[in-house]
């Protein structure tokens, strides 16, 4: 992957590092459920980062269907009334209250599968999702704090003599920027957007004439990216032997 600017050379590299994002489901198969039954039930609340535009499947506690009375999904999204989706086994009926987002649905009919799917995940899906399974032995809960991750767009340009600006635009959460080699950097600036994304900007200067190319490395939960740029000559500099 390479990108070029009109005034000097800029190259993009995307590392193959991805974090906890390959799987969009935390559901376990039956064998795992039996093996880890008590462990799973103990994991009442799960923090789960999910990348925007992917699909996510959220699961209920592993309770046998024959023991069920009611399955309820409670969905609390920022700035919206709480939405509930419930299924009563006895009457085989489903009910929804305050649920307007058509991207949040049962995976299939609740009598077949109690899992909830978000298809696809949007930035507005940040929130708390809880499955409550009512049985004769009591209620079993599993909750998800869903954190929607947004990959930042990375840009790099040389603004003036041996000063480069690297931006990680509209990422969620905020990205971290580092440089190779280290430069004389201004404090990192952060701009917060209404949708919860953050633009991070780092501006650095390199005095040493022996620095040829600078690399901006952006670290983010969705994966890391680097850009590099060959610095332009200082205006008026014609010939330099080794200046170091």
């Amino acid at each position: 992957e390479g990108a070029a600017q009109s005034n000097n050379s800029l190259m993009l590299q995307t590392s193959k590092e991805n974090h906890t994002l390959a799987s969009n489901s935390l559901c376990m198969d039956e064998k795992q459920i039996t093996q880890n039954h008590s462990k799973v039930l103990a994991e009442v609340n799960i923090s789960w980062p999910v990348q925007m535009a992917r699909n996510a499947v959220l699961c209920c506690p592993p309770i046998e269907f024959r023991n069920l009375i009611v399955i309820t999904w409670e969905i609390i999204l920022r700035g919206q009334p709480s939405c509930t989706k419930s299924y009563r086994k006895e009457t085989n009926e489903t009910k929804e209250t305050n649920c307007t987002d058509e991207r949040i649905t049962w995976v299939s009919t609740p009598d077949q599968n109690s899992d909830l799917q978000i298809h696809p995940v949007a930035i507005t899906h940040d929130g708390y999702y809880r499955c409550i399974m009512a049985t004769p032995d009591g209620n079993f809960h599993r909750g998800y704090h869903l954190q929607v991750l947004v990959t930042p767009e990375v840009t790099l340009f040389e603004s003036r003599n041996r000063t480069a600006v690297c931006k990680a635009v509209a990422g969620k959460p905020a990205a971290q920027i580092s440089w190779i080699p280290a430069g004389d950097c201004a404090p990192t600036e952060q701009e917060y957007w209404g949708n919860g994304t953050v633009t991070v900007k780092s501006t650095c200067h390199w005095e040493g004439h022996n620095v040829s190319t600078v690399t901006c490395h952006v670290s983010h939960l969705t994966g890391n990216k680097s850009l590099y740029i060959e610095l332009l000559p200082v205006p008026g500099a014609k010939k330099s032997a080794k200046l170091y």
Partner: antibody
Framework: QVQLQQPGSELVRPGASVKLSCKAS????????MHWVKQRPGQGLEWIGN????????NYDEKFKSKAKLTVDTSSRTAYMQLSSLTSEDSAVYYC???????WGQGTLVTVSA | DVQMIQSPSSLSASLGDIVTMTCQAS??????LHWFQQKPGKAPKLLIS???NLEDGVPSRFSGSRYGTAFTLTISSLEDEDMATYFC?????????FGGGTKLEIK
């Protein structure tokens, strides 16, 4: 796609000079540093220097400061390297490269022989 | 100058093997680099740019990674056509400097 065209070979006498050319296409010639590299037969690679066609700014490695002279002709999108006072030690393949080292010419084999 | 220390200088491996070579800058200087493959009589061919970016048309068995100030080129399953010399180029500091090369031979 960036392409750098170099002549295949040059045969020169000891003590003489040679001017190697590197014609660029497929990118904004004046916006990218052009670098030159030397490779002696069966040996490693050495960076000679670079030139910025947009301003004529040049850097040389100390070792090649009195051996190589880099110039450009922006109208023909061509970079040149003149090698002077040639000896057998200068017999090598010389490459030009641009786009932060990601695009290379095919190299010119310089043979210094009486 | 930043010296690039490349190891091993030569390597003999069998087809299908995983092959790894490394480059490190002297004094642990943080740098960025490219990896090249060169066959006799040919110009170097760029495999990996900027430490980890696989170039278009390069087989996916090649990969590059960075561990602090050390850089690794890995061939996941060696093929006949991979017999060549491999070298790194640091392009962060002037003068740009090359690793000494790793000559890869097939057993």
């Amino acid at each position: 796609q960036v392409q750098l065209q170099q002549p295949g070979s040059e045969l020169v006498r000891p003590g003489a000079s040679v001017k190697l050319s590197c014609k660029a296409s497929g990118h904004t010639f004046t916006s990218y540093w052009m670098h030159w590299v030397k490779q002696r037969p069966g040996q490693g690679l050495e960076w000679i220097g670079n030139i910025y066609p947009g301003s004529g700014s040049i850097n040389y490695d100390e070792k090649f400061k009195s051996k190589a002279k880099l110039t450009v002709d922006t109208s023909s999108r061509t970079a040149y390297m003149q090698l002077s006072s040639l000896t057998s030690e200068d017999s090598a393949v010389y490459y030009c490269l641009t786009m932060t080292g990601t695009s290379w010419g095919q190299g010119t084999l310089v043979t210094v022989s009486a | 100058d930043v010296q690039m220390i490349q190891s091993p200088s030569s390597l003999s491996a069998s087809l299908g093997d995983i092959v790894t070579m490394t480059c490190q800058a002297s004094q642990g200087t943080p740098i960025n680099l490219h990896w090249f493959q060169q066959k006799p009589g040919k110009a170097p061919k760029l495999l990996i740019s900027g430490a980890s970016n696989l170039e278009d048309g390069v087989p996916s068995r090649f990969s590059g990674s960075r561990y602090g100030t050390a850089f690794t080129l890995t061939i996941s399953s060696l093929e006949d056509e991979d017999m060549a010399t491999y070298f790194c180029l640091q392009f962060t500091y002037i003068p740009w400097t090359f690793g000494g090369g790793t000559k890869l031979e097939i057993k």
